[in-house]
Interface confidence: low
């Protein structure tokens, strides 16, 4: 299945963190979502084989990339209290 690290993260405001996602074997697409209490589930970004394919409601302080080995990273910088949320990665062919 899809593997995300870290499972839990506690950090301070203003910090930068990196979330990593390894897609399911055979999958070339990676999707990132944010689920917060006040905003619900929001699509952030979609990569296909290293190429950005679609951008959703992703803040300028957030960036993502997908590497040639297909794993993806979501970078969250200048963190604010409102960034506290569940971050989901999904993959597909």
């Amino acid at each position: 299945g899809v593997t995300q690290t870290p499972k839990h993260l506690i950090t301070a405001t203003g910090q930068r963190v990196t979330l990593r996602c390894s897609p399911r074997s055979g999958d070339l697409s990676v999707y990132w979502y944010q689920q917060s209490l006040d905003q619900g589930l929001q699509f952030l970004i979609h990569y296909y084989n290293g190429e950005e394919r679609a951008k959703g409601n992703i803040l300028e302080r957030f960036s993502a990339q997908q590497f040639p080995d297909l794993h993806s990273e979501l970078n969250l910088s200048s963190l604010e209290l409102g960034d506290s949320a569940l971050y989901f990665c999904a993959s597909s062919v």
Epitope: S22, N49, P68, L70, H71
Partner: antibody, heavy 122, light 107 residues
Framework: QVQLVQSGPELKKPGESVKVSCKAS????????VHWVRQAPGKGLEWMGW????????TYADDFEGRFVFSLDTSASTANLQICSLKNEDTATYYC???????????????WGQGTLVTVSS | DIQMTQSPYSLSASVGDRVTITCKAS??????LAWFQQKPGKPNKLLIY???TLQSGVPSRFSGSGSGTDFTLTISSLEPEDFATYYC?????????FGQGTKLEIK
């Protein structure tokens, strides 16, 4: 420059196992998938699957589930193919190949090893 | 899986000749076709991807064209080092599949 250098030819008996290695150089090994491709004598190329060099996770094509195992020695920038319980029909040249750069659609290969001939005969 | 059919199976030509190899997909693969050159004991060489994009370092006498199901590889003027076997490969969808190869021999 990018190079994939494979181990030498192997002669095995049915039922035995064989391990083919593929040593990468000239690039960051964990940045690119390594694929395996089979070519039986006088036949075309068959994609066997890949190994994710970052996570170590293998992906096998349908026809290569079971007796075929992809593994890594990341410290030596080496990918390995092991075939167990060899059959006569496993006689083939086995190639490793590097996934091409990200941003290109689908699965493709920009650098290949020179091939390793595995002969299975009693 | 998508079936890839190459023709001809083999081809005899002379240095300086213009040769064309064709590849047909069992369903549309858009423009996503690659061509490789194979020589015994040597690593396979990527020539073209995306149907017509020349891989870096590949001589301009090689060109590719086509989209959908029908594709061609053209060598405009054969050099001695071009005598080899050529394979097409679709990279439109999983799993990747190859043509059966075209052996280009010296006449």
């Amino acid at each position: 420059q990018v190079q994939l250098v494979q181990s030498g030819p192997e002669l095995k008996k049915p039922g035995e196992s064989v391990k083919v290695s593929c040593k990468a150089s000239g690039y960051t090994f964990t940045d690119y998938l390594v694929h395996w491709v089979r070519q039986a004598p006088g036949k075309g190329l068959e994609w066997m699957g890949w190994i994710n060099t970052y996570t170590g996770t293998p992906t096998y094509a349908d026809d290569f589930e079971g007796r075929f195992v992809f593994s890594l020695d990341t410290s030596a920038s080496t990918a390995n193919l092991q075939i167990c319980s060899l059959k006569n029909e496993d006689t083939a040249t086995y190639y490793c190949a590097r996934s091409w750069r990200r941003g290109l659609r689908g699965i493709g290969f920009d650098y290949w090893g020179q091939g390793t001939l595995v002969t299975v005969s009693s | 899986d998508i079936q890839m059919t190459q023709s001809p199976y083999s081809l005899s030509a002379s240095v300086g000749d213009r040769v064309t190899i064709t590849c047909k997909a069992s369903k549309s693969i858009n423009k996503y076709l690659a061509w490789f050159q194979q020589k015994p004991g040597k690593p396979n060489k990527l020539l073209i991807y995306d149907g017509s994009t020349l891989q870096s370092g590949v001589p301009s006498r090689f060109s590719g064209s086509g989209s959908g199901t029908d594709f061609t590889l053209t060598i405009s003027s054969l050099e001695p080092e071009d005598f080899a076997t050529y394979y097409c490969q679709q990279h439109n969808e999983y799993p990747p599949t190859f043509g059966q190869g075209t052996k280009l021999e010296i006449k």
